[in-house]
C-alpha cells in the first residue's frame, strides 16, 4: 500500500508542495489522515497527520468544547493507494477572528498562542489579547495548554493559549481518538504564561484533605458531599487528594461528580471524571459538551473507528 505522508503544525507541513508518498510496511492495509482544529475567540489553527495507519477503513468526526475553546477532530482511514488526502486541511475564517474591534473588551487580558510553535509560545513571548464575551458566553479566564494529535505512529503537539470561560480549571481536557486538548485556566491579567505546574488547589477552596488510615476494625464512613462514590480500600501509604470540580453550571452534566479522588499508588480510581462513555477512545473530562458531528460537520457520520487508546 502507498500512502501520502505529512505532518502539519498550524498551517505548515501538509501544504500542497510538501506532500510525500510512502510505501507502507507488510500488514499495513490502511492509509490514514487525521486533522485536529482548535478555535479560540481570537483565531484558529489545525494540526494534521497523514501516513500509513492501522485499524479499519471509515470516518470519524467530532466536535468538542473545553471552557469555550472549541476543538474539531476528523479521522479518515481508507484502503486504496494514496487515498488519504480527502480531508480539507485549510480552515475557514473564524467569524470573530480578525474582527475583534467589533467586540467590547471585558477587562481580561491573556497571552494568545494560536498556531504558534512551542518556541514562540514561551512565557511572556506570545502576543497579548483583550478578552471579550462572545455568543452569549463570558470569557474572563486565561488558558495555557496543548493540543496533541497521534496518528500513523506520529504525534504532533502545539501549545494553546487564549481566553476561556473558566478561571480555575486545572489540568482539564477533552479527547477524541488520538486527539487531546488539555490545560489549565487562571484568573488575572496575563496569568497564563505557564500553568504547567498548576496544582489542583484554589485560594477559595480548602486544599488537601488527608484521610487517616483506619484505626478500628469498624469501617469508617465519610460524607461524600452528595457523591454516591466511595473510596475503595487502599494501601495505608496512599494519600487521597480531594479535588473539588470547578466547572461552572454552563458546562456541568448530570453525571458530574462533586469530588474526584486520586490515589497515588496501585489502587484503582474511585470516582474520577465521569466522561461520555460508549464512544471508543472518547471518555474525557466530565461535563464537557460533545458537539459530535453537528455544528461544523453536518451529515458526515460514518463508521466510528476504534481507537487504540483515548489520547
Amino acid at each position: 500500500l502507498e500512502c501520502y505522508s505529512c505532518v502539519q503544525k498550524a498551517d505548515d507541513g501538509c501544504s500542497p508542495h510538501r506532500m510525500k508518498t510512502v510505501k507502507c510496511g507488510p500488514g499495513v492495509d490502511v492509509c490514514t489522515e487525521a486533522v485536529g482544529a482548535v478555535e479560540t475567540i481570537h483565531g484558529q489553527f489545525s494540526v494534521a497527520v497523514r501516513g500509513c495507519g492501522s485499524g479499519i477503513p471509515g470516518k470519524n468526526d467530532r466536535g468538542l468544547d473545553l471552557h469555550g475553546l472549541l476543538a474539531f477532530f476528523q479521522l479518515q482511514q481508507c484502503s486504496e493507494d494514496r487515498c488519504n488526502a480527502k480531508l480539507n486541511l485549510t480552515l475557514r475564517g473564524l467569524n470573530p477572528a480578525g474582527n475583534e474591534s467589533a467586540y467590547e473588551p471585558n477587562g481580561a487580558e491573556c497571552y494568545s498562542c494560536v498556531g504558534l510553535s512551542r518556541e514562540k509560545c514561551q512565557g511572556s513571548m506570545p502576543p497579548v489579547v483583550n478578552c471579550y464575551n462572545a455568543s452569549g458566553r463570558v470569557y474572563k479566564g486565561c488558558f495555557d495548554g496543548n493540543v496533541t494529535l497521534t496518528a500513523a505512529n506520529v504525534t504532533v503537539s502545539l501549545p494553546v493559549r487564549g481566553c476561556v470561560q473558566d478561571e480555575t480549571c486545572t489540568r482539564d481536557g477533552v479527547t477524541g481518538p488520538g486527539f487531546t486538548l488539555s490545560g489549565s485556566c487562571c484568573q488575572g491579567p496575563r496569568c497564563n504564561a505557564d500553568l504547567r505546574n498548576k496544582t489542583y488547589f484554589s485560594p477559595r477552596i480548602p486544599p488537601l484533605v488527608l484521610l487517616p488510615p483506619p484505626t478500628t476494625a469498624a469501617p469508617s464512613t465519610r460524607a461524600q458531599n452528595s457523591s454516591s462514590t466511595t473510596s475503595t480500600a487502599a494501601p495505608t501509604t496512599t494519600t487521597s487528594i480531594i479535588k473539588p470540580t470547578t466547572a461552572q453550571a454552563s458546562h456541568t452534566s448530570p453525571h458530574e461528580m462533586d469530588l474526584e479522588v486520586i490515589q497515588e499508588e496501585g489502587a484503582s480510581l474511585s470516582g474520577g471524571a465521569a466522561g461520555h462513555g460508549g464512544t471508543a477512545g472518547h471518555g474525557g473530562a466530565a461535563g464537557h459538551q460533545d458537539r459530535s458531528n453537528m455544528e461544523k460537520y453536518p451529515g458526515k457520520g460514518g463508521a466510528q473507528i476504534p481507537a487504540k487508546g483515548g489520547s
Epitope: 498550524a10 500542497p16 508542495h17 510538501r18 506532500m19 510525500k20 494514496r82 475557514r92 498556531g115
Partner: antibody
Framework: EVQLLESGGGLVQPGGSLRLSCAAS????????MSWVRQAPGKGLEWVSY????????YYADSVKGRFTISRDNSKNTLYLQMNSLRAEDTAVYYC??????????WGQGTLVTVTS | QSVLTQPPSASGTPGQRVTISCTGS?????????VHWYQQLPGTAPKLLIY???KRPSGVPDRFSGSKSGTSASLAISGLRSEDEADYYC???????????FGGGTKLTVLG
C-alpha cells in the same frame, strides 16, 4: 473562473525598490497557499517565495532572503511582493501562482521587472 | 545550476513518443516528495501538466503521462503533435532549500 493578475513591474535602478501585487478572483483566496515564481529572460523557472493561507508561514529562496518580503491581504484578495535592494540578476518576469493539488495549478500572466542602471 | 536536472532539449516527429527525464536527489524526489510537470508554450505563462507524479488535471490529454522511481521522474508524450512544442519543467519540494525547486527545463521541438 480562477484569475491571477500581476501588476507593479517596471524599470528600476540597482538598489531600488518595487512592490508587486497579484489580484486574485474566482476562488477562496483566504484558503490558498500562494507563491511568487520568476523567470529571467531566456532562462528557466525559479521559485521566489511562498506564503500560507493565513500568512503565518512564509518561505523564501536563498537568493532573495532579507531583500524581498511576501505578504497578503485576504480581505482584498491580494498577494504582494515587496522587493528591496534590487540587483541586475533580479530582472525577470514575476508570476504569482496558486497552490492547488500539491502543485502550482494556476498562474498569472506575469509582470516584467527590469533592474538596470 | 538547477537542483533538478533535465536534458536541455528533446525532439521527435509527429506521432512519435518522447520521454523527458528529471533527476533529483535524496533531499527532493528521493525523499518521497511528489513530482509535478509544467508546460510553457512560447510567450505564455506556465501551465500545470502533471501533478502528484502521474495525475492529469482536467483538460490535459491522456497522451501526457508521468512516472517516478527513486530519485528520478519522467514525462512521456505519446502521439506527438506540433502544438506540443514548448518548454517542459519538472518540480518538487526540497528539504535542504525549504521550498519547491524546478528543473532547468527541456525545450521540446516537433520536427517536420
Amino acid at each position: 473562473e480562477v484569475q491571477l493578475l500581476e501588476s507593479g513591474g517596471g524599470l528600476v535602478q540597482p538598489g531600488g525598490s518595487l512592490r508587486l501585487s497579484c489580484a486574485a478572483s474566482g476562488f477562496t483566496f483566504s484558503n490558498a497557499w500562494m507563491s511568487w515564481v520568476r523567470q529571467a529572460p531566456g532562462k528557466g523557472l525559479e521559485w521566489v517565495s511562498y506564503i500560507s493561507s493565513s500568512g503565518s508561514t512564509i518561505y523564501y529562496a536563498d537568493s532573495v532572503k532579507g531583500r524581498f518580503t511576501i505578504s497578503r491581504d485576504n480581505s482584498k484578495n491580494t498577494l504582494y511582493l515587496q522587493m528591496n535592494s534590487l540587483r541586475a540578476e533580479d530582472t525577470a518576469v514575476y508570476y504569482c501562482a496558486r497552490e492547488g493539488l500539491w502543485a502550482f495549478d494556476y498562474w498569472g500572466q506575469g509582470t516584467l521587472v527590469t533592474v538596470t542602471s | 545550476q538547477s537542483v533538478l536536472t533535465q536534458p536541455p532539449s528533446a525532439s521527435g516527429t509527429p506521432g512519435q513518443r518522447v520521454t523527458i527525464s528529471c533527476t533529483g536527489s535524496s533531499s527532493n524526489i528521493g525523499a518521497g516528495y511528489v513530482v509535478h510537470w509544467y508546460q510553457q508554450l512560447p510567450g505564455t505563462a506556465p501551465k500545470l501538466l502533471i501533478y502528484d507524479n502521474n495525475k492529469r488535471p482536467s483538460g490535459v490529454p491522456d497522451r501526457f503521462s508521468g512516472s517516478k522511481s527513486g530519485t528520478s521522474a519522467s514525462l512521456a508524450i505519446s502521439g506527438l503533435r506540433s502544438e506540443d512544442e514548448a518548454d517542459y519543467y519538472c518540480a518538487a519540494w526540497d528539504d535542504m532549500l525549504n521550498g519547491p525547486v524546478f528543473g532547468g527545463g527541456t525545450k521540446l521541438t516537433v520536427l517536420g
